[in-house]
Amino acid sequence: GWVWNQFFVPEEMNTTSHHIGQLRSDLDNGNNSFQYKLLGAGAGSTFIIDERTGDIYAIQKLDREERSLYILRAQVIDIATGRAVEPESEFVIKVSDINDNEPKFLDEPYEAIVPEMSPEGTLVIQVTASDADDPSSGNNARLLYSLLQGQPYFSVEPTTGVIRISSKMDRELQDEYWVIIQAKDMIGQPGALSGTTSVLIKLSDVNDNKPIFKESLYRLTVSESAPTGTSIGTIMAYDNDIGENAEMDYSIEEDDSQTFDIITNHETQEGIVILKKKVDFEHQNHYGIRAKVKNHHVPEQLMKYHTEASTTFIKIQVEDVDEP
């Protein structure tokens, strides 16, 4: 019968010929009367056999990630008679893995959006690297994730690649972050290979800023001939938030004379001061009103950012018109 052990050949061997093992018949008494032959894919080109001894050699560098096993056939012939000594037999040569592949992130580019001011522990995104090495061969394809850039705002779970928030962020200070994640095989042991990926994390806006007047004092003038409904000027607040979170409403906080009104231009986000009652220079030639501004939409949980509306003082000078 045939005698052999399992055949393994390490991938990426640089030697011109590498002894893998021996195939022999138990009828072979070692007097060189038998001839061994190798057949099948790779026979003669990748693997050769010593016809006299049955020793098998790899004569080419192998790449397990390209092909991890070879199924070959062996024959043994009595040289004297030309007849088969043993029935033809199939055997397998397995290519054993070495750690020759670095982890790769296949789903790049990564991009995620997370609301600003999200609490610590909020899930941002999961990144996944793959390693072409053999997951069943030691730690060659066992990966550990780590953060190369992004502290102290982000953290990554070492075994899952899940990125989480580790510190609150304010979009108004910085609206996007580049996080660099490294995946290392060999669970980080010596000889490990690594790959990196970048994750663009954008912060979406929440209404954490109240509108604030650009000026603490506005000066406007109104002619005593101006009819009611006249727009006498504009006031403006700014809000560091964006979009709907920056929409605002202006109103009068104090006008004992009840002479003016303020309406909001929702396109420009300006407050328009309107004359509500006609003025008379001879009766009163200047007015003071206090205006306030508030956001249009404020969720209950963000009300803490909106205590005490911003106010401004408006000095309104009445212009004299010569009366006939």
Epitope: S216, L217, R219, T221, D256, S257, E282, H283, Q284, N285, H286, Y287, G288, F313, K315, Q317, E319
Partner: antibody
Framework: QVQLVESGGGVVQPGRSLRLSCAAS????????MHWVRQAPGKGLEWVAV????????YYADSVKGRFTISRDTSKNTLYLQMNSLRAEDTAVYYC????????????WGQGTLVSVSS | EIVLTQSPGTLSLSPGERATLSCRAS???????LAWYHQRPGQAPRLLIY???SRATGIPDRFSGSGSGTDFALTISSLEPEDFAVYYC????????FGQGTKVEIK
């Protein structure tokens, strides 16, 4: 600190002219409306004129309208009062005063300059 | 024009006494646009009270203002030697006018 220093007062004959100056320092002159107020010897205070922070509006007491002109030079931080056709009743100490930012009262005053109109 | 009438013309008091000065307007003063000043001899006026009741910067709390409409008052709770001076009320509801003054003198 805020300082207002008047100058230009003196003795002048009726019908003549005089220009008073008020040098301002210690605050942003271009942000404040400025006034002139006078006080005849032994009498009370009388408001004279106001000029807006940007110099675009001026108002005068009826007693000086058409004779006095208030002006300002922001580059020199100086307020002026040009007084023409002076009369004996214009004799007074003239004060420049700063109007409060959020109000119309006068929070800072100069030390005053005396104008005497007599023949 | 709004005319302001102050009373009394002169108030003779001793240091430590309470002084109450009155200012009456010929027509209603809008939005409590009324101020009080004092003037020591040879000096410029100094703002004490604005908006009828708000103390100006650096003014001690013995000075208080009250009133609305046409009747206003300045109270000095306990007179100090430096408080003996002439006091003026001023309206700035319509243009600017001053009262004729109240002299607070040492008794």
């Amino acid at each position: 600190q805020v300082q207002l220093v008047e100058s230009g007062g003196g003795v002048v004959q009726p019908g003549r002219s005089l220009r008073l100056s008020c040098a301002a320092s210690g605050f942003t002159f271009s942000s404040y409306d400025m006034h002139w107020v006078r006080q005849a010897p032994g009498k009370g205070l009388e408001w004279v004129a106001v000029i807006s922070y940007d110099g675009t509006n001026e108002y005068y007491a009826d007693s000086v309208k058409g004779r006095f002109t208030i002006s300002r030079d922001t580059s020199k931080n100086t307020l002026y009062l040009q007084m023409n056709s002076l009369r004996a009743e214009d004799t007074a100490v003239y004060y420049c005063a700063r109007e409060r930012y959020f109000d119309w009262s006068f929070d800072y005053w100069g030390q005053g300059t005396l104008v005497s109109v007599s023949s | 024009e709004i005319v302001l009438t102050q009373s009394p013309g002169t108030l003779s008091l001793s240091p430590g006494e309470r002084a109450t000065l009155s200012c009456r307007a010929s027509q209603s003063v809008s939005n409590t646009y009324l101020a009080w000043y004092h003037q020591r001899p040879g000096q410029a006026p100094r703002l004490l009270i604005y908006g009828a009741s708000s103390r100006a910067t650096g003014i001690p709390d013995r000075f208080s203002g009250s009133g609305s409409g046409t009747d206003f008052a300045l109270t000095i709770s306990s007179l100090e030697p430096e408080d003996f001076a002439v006091y003026y009320c001023q309206q700035y509801s319509n243009s600017w006018t001053f009262g004729q003054g109240t002299k607070v003198e040492i008794k």
